[in-house]
Amino acid sequence: MAVTACQGLGFVVSLIGIAGIIAATCMDQWSTQDLYNNPVTAVFNYQGLWRSCVRESSGFTECRGYFTLLGLPAMLQAVRALMIVGIVLGAIGLLVSIFALKCIRIGSMEDSAKANMTLTSGIMFIVSGLCAIAGVSVFANMLVTNFWMSTANMYTGMGGMVQTVQTRYTFGAALFVGWVAGGLTLIGGVMMCIACRGLAPEETNYKAVSYHASGHSVAYKPGGFKASTGFGSNTKNKKIYDGGARTEDEVQSYPSKHDYV
C-alpha cells in the first residue's frame, strides 16, 4: 500500500512539476524591468525565452518574437535547450510512469517490469528536474551579471542636462515557477525511485508445500485467498509454486470477477 501511495504521489508531483516547467518555458516574464531607479515609468519591459514584451500603462502590450537564431546569445540558446530537454524527458517519463503505476494493470506485466519502468521514469524525472533547475539558474546568473554591468554604467550620457537611463532587468516570475517546478519534478523522480525498490521482487524464493488430498487434485497455496482477491500485497514478493511453477502474478493475470483494474 505504501509503495503504491509513494508511486502515485511521485507521479502526481512529477506531473505538476512538468506542467510547471512547460508553463515556465512558455512564460514571457523570465526577466522584468527593474523599477528601483525609475519607479514611475509609464512603460514596462519584460522578456521571455522566445519573445520580448512592452506593456504601456495605458494597457497596451506589444510582444516581438526573437526571429533570429544565430543572433541570440549562446546562453539563451543553452537555456532554451535545457528547458526543452527537461520537457521532453519529463513527457517521456510521464508516459513510462503511467504504465508503471501499480494501480493500472496492463496484460500480464510482471512486478519486475513495473519496477524497472518506475525506476526509468524516476531517473527521467530527476534529470528533467535538474535540466529545468539548471536552465533557470543559468538564466538567473546571466541576469545578475548583466544587472551589475548595467549598474556600473547606469547613466551613459551624463554630459550636461541630458541623461540616458539604461534599462536594467531583474528576476521575472518564470524563474521562480521554473525553480519550483524543477524541484517538484526532482522530488517526484526521487519518490518514483523509492517506490521502485518496494516494487522489485526479492531474490529469495519461498517454496510452498503441496499437500495432495486423496481423491482431490487441489493444491494448497499459502496466501492463495489474497491472490484471488486481487489485493495480494502481502504475498507480492513471494513466488508460489503450483505444479507448473507459475508466479502469483501469472496466476492473477487471468481476469476473474475479483480482479480490480
Epitope: V40, A42, S57, S58, G59, V162, T164, T167
Partner: antibody, heavy 117, light 113 residues
Framework: QVQLQESGPGLVKPSETLSLTCTVS????????VSWVRQPPGKGLEWIGV???????NYHSTLISRVTISKDTSKSQFSLKLSSVTAADTAVYYC???????????WGQGTLVTVSS | DIVMTQSPDSLAVSLGERATINCKSS????????????LTWYQQKPGQPPKLLIY???TRESGVPDRFSGSGSGTDFTLTISSLQAEDVAVYYC?????????FGGGTKLEIK
C-alpha cells in the same frame, strides 16, 4: 464612438475642494486609463494625473498632496478632486482617454473652473 | 521630473512652406524594450481641446494629414509640417509619455507669415 464630457461647478472659493466629473462612453473603463489635464487662461497644458484601467493612479509631483482621481465603473464616470484651491488653480480642466503609446487620443471639451471669493 | 523644452515659442511661416518645431527632453524617451520613443505631439486650435497628431515620436494618428511628420530619437525631436495650410494655425505641444509625471512642453504658436 468615444466621448468624454467634463462637468462640475464653474466657480470655487479659495481653500475649498474643486470636484469635477468626467462621464465617458464608447470604451471600457476597466481597459483604458483617463488623464486629467488643465490649462490656465492663455497658458500651456499641465498634466494633473491619471487613473488606469486597473484602478491604479499616478499624479503630478507638484499636486500629489492635493489631488485624488477615482472612478465609478457602474456610472461610467471619472472624478477629480483638488483640495485647498487657490487662484493659481483657475483653468480649463480636460479629461482625456489614454491610448497607444500612452498618448491622449480622445479629449473632452473642457470645463472652465474659476477660483475666486 | 522630465523637463520638456520646445523651440521656438512662436513661428511664422508662409502658406505652402515647411514649418519645423523642436522639442528637447531632459532625459531620453527611448524605450530599449521596443526601440520606441515615447514622445507625443498635439495640436490645439483656439477654443478647442488638444488633438493628438503623432505618438511614438513618428507614428501618425489615424485621420491626421500626411503633411504632418515626426522624427527624432532619445532627447531631440522634431515636428514637421511639409506644406503649411491655413487650418494648421494652432499651438503645438510635445509631451513626455515615458515617465511620470507625463509632462508637456511649453507649446509653440504657429502663425501664417
Amino acid at each position: 464612438q468615444v466621448q468624454l464630457q467634463e462637468s462640475g461647478p464653474g466657480l470655487v472659493k479659495p481653500s475649498e475642494t474643486l470636484s469635477l466629473t468626467c462621464t465617458v462612453s464608447g470604451f471600457s473603463l476597466t481597459s483604458y486609463g483617463v488623464s486629467w489635464v488643465r490649462q490656465p487662461p492663455g497658458k500651456g497644458l499641465e498634466w494633473i494625473g491619471v487613473i488606469w484601467g486597473d484602478g491604479s493612479t499616478n499624479y503630478h509631483s507638484t499636486l500629489i498632496s492635493r489631488v485624488t482621481i477615482s472612478k465609478d465603473t457602474s456610472k461610467s464616470q471619472f472624478s477629480l478632486k483638488l483640495s485647498s484651491v487657490t487662484a493659481a488653480d483657475t483653468a480649463v480642466y480636460y479629461c482625456a482617454k489614454a491610448g497607444r503609446g500612452n498618448a491622449l487620443d480622445y479629449w473632452g471639451q473642457g470645463t472652465l473652473v474659476t477660483v475666486s471669493s | 521630473d522630465i523637463v520638456m523644452t520646445q523651440s521656438p515659442d512662436s513661428l511664422a511661416v508662409s502658406l505652402g512652406e515647411r514649418a519645423t518645431i523642436n522639442c528637447k527632453s531632459s532625459q531620453s524617451l527611448l524605450n530599449s524594450g521596443n526601440q520606441k520613443n515615447y514622445l507625443t505631439w498635439y495640436q490645439q486650435k483656439p477654443g478647442q481641446p488638444p488633438k493628438l497628431l503623432i505618438y511614438w515620436a513618428s507614428t501618425r494618428e489615424s485621420g491626421v494629414p500626411d503633411r504632418f511628420s515626426g522624427s527624432g530619437s532619445g532627447t531631440d525631436f522634431t515636428l514637421t509640417i511639409s506644406s503649411l495650410q491655413a487650418e494648421d494655425v494652432a499651438v503645438y505641444y510635445c509631451q513626455n509619455d515615458y515617465s511620470f509625471p507625463l509632462t508637456f512642453g511649453g507649446g509653440t504658436k504657429l502663425e501664417i507669415k
